[in-house]
């Protein structure tokens, strides 16, 4: 059995978050993993929740009673998601903490804006133009 | 020319984002996208890149001077990133709209946890577990 | 300060056996994954094995595949490299070395190393 | 697997810079970090660039670290030359795999 899964039942119940009741309305994540198939799809997705589990991490940092339990999933993840790559996780990390309300961060981004945009489509890196990027579909 | 390029050039204006004193102190996204070669890679990198900008561009929604620019530059983001799925665009802005200090929302990540861990990596998939997963380097 | 010190070393046949040990102190030796490096005489350095902090995931170079064995005891602060079937190769100064982080990648500190001779 | 390829020596006067390029066979060289290490003679390693550029405390600011995607390159470069600079240099990376690499090595002779 993965470490994680121990310490995921002790967040459960610091958070009671085991009552059956937590699952009424639908879910948060499992719902959308479900949806898609393709992995880039699903890295898509899942950039998103890891990015949210860090998150609320680092809300309950302080927290002595859960850290033991936080930091054994953090690490799982670096593992699962990151594939083990420091490097990959401190790129995701900076891409996280830049803050939308710095000018500076602003300024930059808005310069950068026509080059990251070019790089979108993994048409952009092969040349090729997939019709299916002329229309915004329903 | 695809029609954000004008787009941007007028966002340039507009943040004062044009002057070469912005490219300072390194680049927010483009050396991050630089390292990252692997389509799936690159879309855990892109998905925080994209969610950055659409937190950016809410921002200024009320912003008239800049709305056709701003519309624009979404619509070919739409386009190229979620490969104009409209569904894939939903579910990627449900996930960027969760509130991590939400209670309910707390209760639910921790309660979808353990699978949401289950999913994170390739082999979980297929069965396979790859050495490479096993140890976090450097 | 961190301190890494190795013994074990010395003359062994060909074939024969030799256990190198590689006693840590100045950090929670338990939170950072461990190698061995080592280097021949007048060579350049290869890695050899590597650790984790629990010691639950190990990690061996090709050329030691199946007849070295890496191993800690995190109560005793001292990581381990058994090495079975020695060969005229394994000729080398062997270096214990710390991990920057519970992770391969930057070896932070370094041990001042043991040599192991294996010769007939 | 991969490799990592140094020049075997570089010599240069003192107060003079150096440069030594690491270029990396198999996978790119920028998702991975590299580290540098000085080895004196008769001495145990020692870091002087980790994470592509970082400088541990106590390594002077003479030694940087970059990386170039276009080469595929990492490259040390040593400025203001000194006679204590005079070892061998060692660029290190790892893969996907769990394989730690070190480079051949690189004699930095002070003239």
């Known amino acids: 059995q993965d470490p994680y899964v121990k310490e995921a039942e002790n967040l459960k119940k610091y958070f009671n978050a085991g009552h059956s009741d937590v699952a009424d309305n639908g879910t948060l994540f499992l719902g959308i993993l479900k949806n898609w198939k393709e992995e880039s799809d699903r890295k898509i997705m899942q950039s998103q929740i890891v990015s949210f589990y860090f998150k609320l991490f680092k809300n309950f940092k302080d927290d002595q009673s859960i850290q033991k339990s936080v930091e054994t999933i953090k690490e799982d993840m670096n593992v699962k998601f990151f594939n083990s790559n420091k490097k990959k996780r401190d790129d995701f990390e900076k891409l996280t903490n830049y803050s939308v309300t710095d000018l500076n961060v602003q300024r930059k981004a808005i310069h950068e804006l026509i080059q990251v945009m070019a790089e979108l489509s993994p048409a952009a890196k092969t040349g090729k133009r997939k019709r299916s990027q002329m229309l915004f579909r329903g | 020319q695809d029609p954000y390029v004008k787009e941007a050039e007028n966002l340039k204006k507009y943040f004062n984002a044009g002057h070469s004193d912005v490219a300072d102190n390194g680049t927010l996204f483009l050396g991050i996208l630089k390292n990252w070669k692997e389509e799936s890679d690159r879309k855990i990198m892109q998905s925080q890149i994209v969610s950055f900008y659409f937190k950016l561009f809410k921002n200024f929604k009320d912003d008239q001077s800049i709305q056709k620019s701003v519309e624009t530059i979404k619509e070919d983001m739409n386009v190229k990133f979620f490969n104009s799925n409209k569904k894939k665009r939903d579910d990627f802005e449900k996930l960027t709209n969760y509130s991590v200090t939400d209670l309910n929302v707390q209760r639910k990540a921790i309660h979808e946890l353990i699978q949401v861990m289950a999913e994170l990596s390739p082999a979980a998939k297929t069965g396979k577990r790859k050495r490479s997963q096993m140890l976090f380097r450097g | 300060e961190v301190q890494l010190l190795e013994s074990g070393g010395g003359l062994v046949q060909p074939g024969g056996s030799l256990r190198l040990s590689c006693a840590a102190s100045?950090?929670?030796?338990?939170?950072?994954?461990m190698s061995w490096v080592r280097q021949a005489p007048g060579k350049g350095l290869e890695w050899v094995s590597a650790?984790?902090?629990?010691?639950?995931?190990?990690y061996y170079a090709d050329s030691v595949k199946g007849r070295f064995t890496i191993s800690r005891d995190n109560s005793k602060n001292t990581l381990y490299l058994q090495m079975n079937s020695l060969r005229a190769e394994d000729t080398a100064v062997y270096y214990c070395?710390?991990?920057?982080?519970?992770?391969?990648?930057?070896?932070?500190?370094w041990g001042r190393g043991t040599l192991v001779t294996v010769s007939s | 697997n991969f490799m990592l390829t140094q020049p075997h020596s570089v010599s240069e006067s003192p107060g003079r810079t150096i440069t030594i390029s690491c270029t990396r066979s198999?996978?790119?060289?920028?998702?991975?970090?590299v580290q540098w290490y000085q080895q004196r003679p008769g001495t145990a390693p020692t870091t002087v660039i980790y994470?592509?550029?970082?400088?541990p405390s106590g390594v002077p600011d003479r030694f940087s670290g970059s990386i170039d995607s276009s080469s595929n390159s990492a490259s040390l470069t040593i400025s203001g030359l000194k006679t204590e600079d005079e070892a061998d240099y060692y660029c290190?990376?790892?893969?996907?795999?769990?394989?730690?690499?070190f480079g051949g090595g690189t004699k930095v002779t002070v003239l």
């Open positions: 070395a710390k991990d920057g982080w519970n992770a391969l990648g930057w070896l932070e500190s």
């Open positions: 100045g950090f929670t030796f338990s939170s950072y994954a």
């Open positions: 650790i984790s902090g629990s010691g639950g995931s190990t």
């Open positions: 198999g996978g790119s060289i920028g998702s991975y970090y």
């Open positions: 994470d592509d550029k970082k400088r």
């Open positions: 290190q990376s790892y893969d996907s795999n769990n394989l730690v690499v």
